[in-house]
Interface confidence: low
Amino acid sequence: EEELQVIQPDKSVLVAAGETATLRCTATSLIPVGPIQWFRGAGPGRELIYNQKEGHFPRVTTVSDLTKRNNMDFSIRIGNITPADAGTYYCVKFRKGSPDDVEFKSGAGTELSVRAKPSAPVVSGPAARATPQHTVSFTCESHGFSPRDITLKWFKNGNELSDFQTNVDPVGESVSYSIHSTAKVVLTREDVHSQVICEVAHVTLQGDPLRGTANLSETIRVPPTLEVTQQPVRAENQVNVTCQVRKFYPQRLQLTWLENGNVSRTETASTVTENKDGTYNWMSWLLVNVSAHRDDVKLTCQVEHDGQPAVSKSHDLKVSAHPKEQGSNTAAENTGSNERNIY
């Protein structure tokens, strides 16, 4: 009679994470009598997956009834597969011995590969804001996928980016993999409303890639432009000076008026107007009582934006042409904030 062979017909099996893997194994003979065991791996470190005679194997079920005398099907199902279950599984026949069972013959092995979806890509930008014309780096990370093959693309407002570098780790065999990519993006003044998108495509996603986004509003700082102008005289001894603060982002801004280098008033931008590109405009004005000045006045609008060093714009106010009113010691009329701001 021909000697028993242990046949594992599937060289490899591919299963999606969370599903059930069926590992097939048949024997060609009922002789010798003895149990089977399933192992993952070979050698001293091999892991027992199923033992016909003993133990608790809650994730494993047999395909056929192993208690039947004529059974030669030793296939098993392993439920709720995870990437950690990947490996080569061996069906091993034992011969009933005296006093103990001994290993008789092993199947050739079935390699179980697990398809696992990548995690949602997480995109992160630089820790500090940057101004237009500067290049900033964005990173994208996704983890836990298998097999290793994966495609990652970067987009800015729907336009594909080309300046990026991607690594998939680890380099060798692993139960699951991670991808890390860094893209370089040049900022423009119009990028407040822009988005950077990292797109990951993998066999497990069935053509529906995962996307992670970052808003450039979290990254960009658009510094303001300043313009100081003198308005027509509102009253005989008063001059209205305005400081137009244009095209800035984010909103955090503090303005200080200086008269001949001395602080006259400080205010914080609150109600601002928003431009179509997402930047803001703001205006502050100062009523100067020219009769309080004997000489020309240098008015300076000084703006500190988003914690950056102050920028300023000055305006020389000529007072010689205006009559001087004695007894007035107020150089600037410190009206309420709402009155000072023109929107």
Partner: antibody
Framework: EVQLQESGGGLVKPGGSLKLSCAAS????????MSWVRQTPEKRLEWVAI????????YYPDSVKGRFTISRDNAKNTLYLQMSSLKSEDTGMYYC????????WGQGTTLTVST | QIVLTQSPAIMSASPGEKVTMTCSAS?????MYWYQQKPGSSPRLLIY???NLASGVPVRFSGSGSGTSYSLTISRMEAEDAATYYC?????????FGGGTKLEIK
């Protein structure tokens, strides 16, 4: 009812030998995977030996490999751990366990390796 | 070998309080196993295959986790739960235990 009773512990000098026994009852020893696990005086657990059902395989960690031997006498339904070239770091409580994972534990026997 | 790090090493809880302890593996493991040991007694299997309760273990015990991060939770602490808890892995040879978390009753 499954019961495991260890014996054979004691005081041994470094370099000495000792054989621990584990008497099993309530099941047939030969058909189960059995292990020895030790607990150090600092209460750390360390697996030291395993013998699979049918005595097919025996495994040991590097810390005891070549010095410890696990075996069983199925007629007596008893598991053994032969220990030689003992070191002070082998000191501890030795437990006999059944199955993988360790569903059943004995009460343990104490080994002290000291001059 | 895979090193299992348990935290905290010592903790205390009042009766009825929820308790969570963790076991971190130096490399990914397939499943985690948890044992309970009371003073003067042998360890006892509590949870096998990460989340399955061993026979006779109260349902207030639960296990969870994957990869390198696993945890054991007691939904409502009872006085009899004061013990040392050990995690263990069978995924990689040699099979190792964590250093233990000692849980005391307040």
């Amino acid at each position: 009812e499954v019961q495991l009773q260890e014996s054979g512990g004691g005081l041994v000098k470094p370099g000495g030998s000792l054989k621990l026994s584990c008497a099993a009852s309530g099941f047939t020893l030969s058909t189960y995977t059995m292990s020895w696990v030790r607990q150090t005086p600092e209460k750390r657990l360390e697996w030291v030996a395993i013998i699979t059902s049918g005595d097919t395989y025996t495994y040991y960690p590097d810390s005891v490999k070549g010095r410890f031997t696990i075996s069983r006498d199925n007629a007596k339904n008893t598991l053994y751990l032969q220990m030689s070239s003992l070191k002070s770091e082998d000191t501890g409580m030795y437990y006999c366990t059944r199955d993988r994972p360790l569903f059943h534990w004995g009460q343990g026997t104490t080994l002290t390796v000291s001059t | 070998q895979i090193v299992l790090t348990q935290s905290p090493a010592i903790m205390s809880a009042s009766p009825g309080e929820k308790v969570t302890m963790t076991c971190s593996a130096s490399s990914s493991v397939s499943y985690m196993y948890w044992y309970q040991q009371k003073p003067g007694s042998s360890p006892r299997l509590l949870i096998y295959d990460t989340s399955n309760l061993a026979s006779g273990v109260p349902v207030r015990f639960s296990g969870s986790g994957s990869g390198t991060s696993y945890s054991l939770t007691i939904s409502r602490m009872e006085a009899e739960d004061a013990a040392t808890y050990y995690c263990q892995q069978w995924s990689s040879f040699p099979w190792t235990f964590g250093g233990g978390t000692k849980l005391e009753i307040k």
